[in-house]
């Protein structure tokens, strides 16, 4: 009878994670007498992954009916792979002893593993850029294999070139991760705009993952101020307005001054949005000019997202505005609380 | 079902020969290593002989150049051969399958019962 | 050739009873030891094998332990149809051998 040969026809297997992978092995002969063996790997590390002989190997299941002598295909099923699962493969006959001694080993199958990436994680900048500034993004998917995989970036459906990929490690591994970092150009229309990372794999099927990024977590449009007169409203009655305009994101704080002293602080509450996703907001002061001598200089100071305050002014000419008569003295001489100056918002 | 039956017993004087036969069925009898037991009356058990797949033969020192092991395929039989019987051979003879990849005893047939006696 | 030995030779148990029974070989045999059961005037049934694993349709009140020299077949609730003979054999190389036996009897 002709030497007992360990057939492995599948020089390789590729298999999606969480499924089963059959490997094929068949013996020519039924002599000499002992167990088939599959190990990963070779060597004197190699992992025991099946032994006909003994043991317990919830994972491994037999293709074929192995009661019977006559059976010589000694194929086996792995369910439930991992990517850690990767590897080759042996099919070893051994001959019966103390010990068994290995007779023979099959050449070896390939076992790939198939793992979907990760959904791609996109991370921006740790503090708020204003337009004109250009920003980093970064994309972060994990746990894929093969190592082929594709990733583009965009930024409102618009597809970004600049951008720097790298898929680590850069050798065999039973799984990889890809990390990728895009340089982006803030305009003061970008409080709705998207940036998309893009992974394509060929576990995906055509169906790319994507994850996303707000830039309206990332921008900050600073506002701008227009202080301006208004007719007046009663006798020796001015109104003064700040309008605060364009400005992301809400938090703001106006301060009125007068002639440099504080006169009064509110926190933006009830703005107007635009289109563009930024706020409008505006503040009023009514001046009871008769309580003044001289000219004002009324400045309306903003605090917008922590930055540091910005200003207008505007010179209130109390000379244009005949007093009344003894007001002024009144209100010095009593030394009232009655304010000489009125605000409100909106 | 997997069946093995023993035939061929009986009384024989010294110095003859029987032979022994076992008809197996519920399995091809070909592709397993196929053995010989005996059981001396109120003794223990011995095992006798045997045949592997390719058709090479084993035998207990006792029993070498006197006993020969054979099978017929084509009868899906084992056969045992014995001369120059002793008194010492009289036991009962068992038909005995080899297991699948160890050649562990699985199957054993109902006897035979040879008596060697003048 | 291999020798096996058997302990003890006789034993004498009771229903219910956990009972061990040793078996050691001349030399190293790997697992290659099976244990059987013979009742009188009965062909021997086939137990154990690879000094561990149960033949089909074997109750698993029935278990094996050992490799290389030592081996043990436990019983662990006696039952009145447990009362019978047992052998151990090796087969690790020709010629396979027997232990001489361990009668077991109802006390």
């Known amino acids: 009878e002709e030497e007992l040969q360990v057939i492995q026809p599948d020089k390789s297997v590729s298999v999606a994670a969480g499924e089963s992978a059959i490997l094929h092995c068949t013996v020519t002969s039924l002599i000499p007498v002992g167990p088939i063996q599959w190990f990963r790997g070779a060597g004197p590390a190699r992992e025991l992954i099946y032994n006909q002989k003994e043991g317990h190997f919830p994972r491994v299941t037999t293709v074929s009916e192995s009661t019977k002598r006559e059976n010589m295909d000694f194929s086996i099923s792995i369910s439930n792979i991992t990517p850690a699962d990767a590897g080759t493969y042996y099919c070893v006959k051994f001959r019966k002893g103390s010990p068994d001694t290995e007779f023979k080993s099959g050449a070896g199958t390939e076992l790939s593993v198939r793992a979907k990436p990760s959904a791609p994680v996109v991370s921006g900048p740790a503090a708020r850029a204003t337009p004109q500034h250009t920003v980093s993004f970064t994309c972060e998917s994990h746990g894929f294999s093969p190592r082929d995989i594709t990733l583009k970036w965009f930024k409102n459906g618009n597809e970004l070139s600049d951008f720097q990929t790298n898929v680590d490690p850069v050798g065999e591994s039973v799984s990889y991760s890809i990390h990728s970092t895009a340089k982006v150009v803030l305009t003061r229309e970008d409080v709705h705009s998207q940036v998309i990372c893009e992974v394509a794999h060929v576990t995906l099927q055509g169906d790319p993952l994507r994850g996303t990024a707000n830039l309206s977590e990332t921008i900050r449009v600073p506002p701008t101020l227009e202080v301006t007169q208004q007719p007046v409203r009663a006798e020796n009655q001015v109104n003064v307005t700040c309008q605060v305009r364009k400005f992301y994101p809400q938090r703001l704080q106006l301060t009125w001054l007068e002639n440099g002293n504080v006169s009064r602080t509110e926190t933006a509450s009830t703005v107007t949005e635009n289109k563009d996703g930024t706020y409008n907001w505006m503040s009023w002061l009514l001046v009871n000019v008769s309580a003044h001598r001289d000219d004002v200089k009324l400045t309306c100071q903003v605090e917008h997202d922590g930055q540091p305050a910005v200003s207008k002014s505007h010179d209130l000419k109390v000379s244009a505005h005949p007093k009344e008569q003894g007001s002024n003295t009144a209100a010095e001489n009593t030394g009232s609380n009655e304010r000489n100056i009125y605000g409100g918002s909106g | 079902e997997v069946q093995l039956v023993e035939s061929g017993g009986g009384l024989v004087q010294p110095g003859g020969s029987l032979r022994l036969s076992c008809a197996a069925s519920g399995f091809t009898l070909s592709s397993y290593d196929m053995h010989w037991v005996r059981q001396a009356p109120g003794k223990g058990l011995e095992w006798v002989s045997a045949?592997?797949?390719?058709?090479?033969?084993y035998y207990t020192g006792s029993v070498k150049g006197r006993f020969t092991i054979s099978r017929e395929n084509a009868k899906n039989s084992l056969y045992l051969q014995m001369n120059s019987l002793r008194a010492g051979d009289t036991a009962v003879y068992y038909c005995?399958?080899?297991?699948?990849?160890?050649?562990?005893?699985?199957?054993w047939g109902q006897g035979t019962m040879v008596t060697v006696s003048s | 050739d291999i020798q096996m030995t058997q302990s003890p030779s006789s034993l004498s148990a009771s229903v219910g009873d956990r009972v061990t029974i040793t078996c050691r070989a001349s030399?190293?045999?790997?697992?290659?030891l099976a244990w059987f059961q013979q009742k009188p005037g009965k062909a021997p049934k086939s137990l154990i094998y690879t000094a561990s694993s149960l033949h089909s349709g074997v109750p698993s009140k029935f278990s094996g332990s050992g490799s290389g020299t030592d081996f043990t077949l436990t019983i662990s609730s006696l039952q009145p149809e447990d009362f019978a003979t047992y052998y151990c054999?090796?087969?690790?190389?020709?010629?396979?051998?027997f232990g001489q036996g361990t009668k077991l009897e109802i006390k």
């Open positions: 045949i592997g797949t390719a058709g090479d033969t």
């Open positions: 005995v399958r080899g297991g699948v990849w160890d050649d562990a005893f699985d199957i």
């Open positions: 030399q190293d045999i790997n697992n290659y």
């Open positions: 054999q090796q087969y690790v190389s020709y010629p396979y051998t």
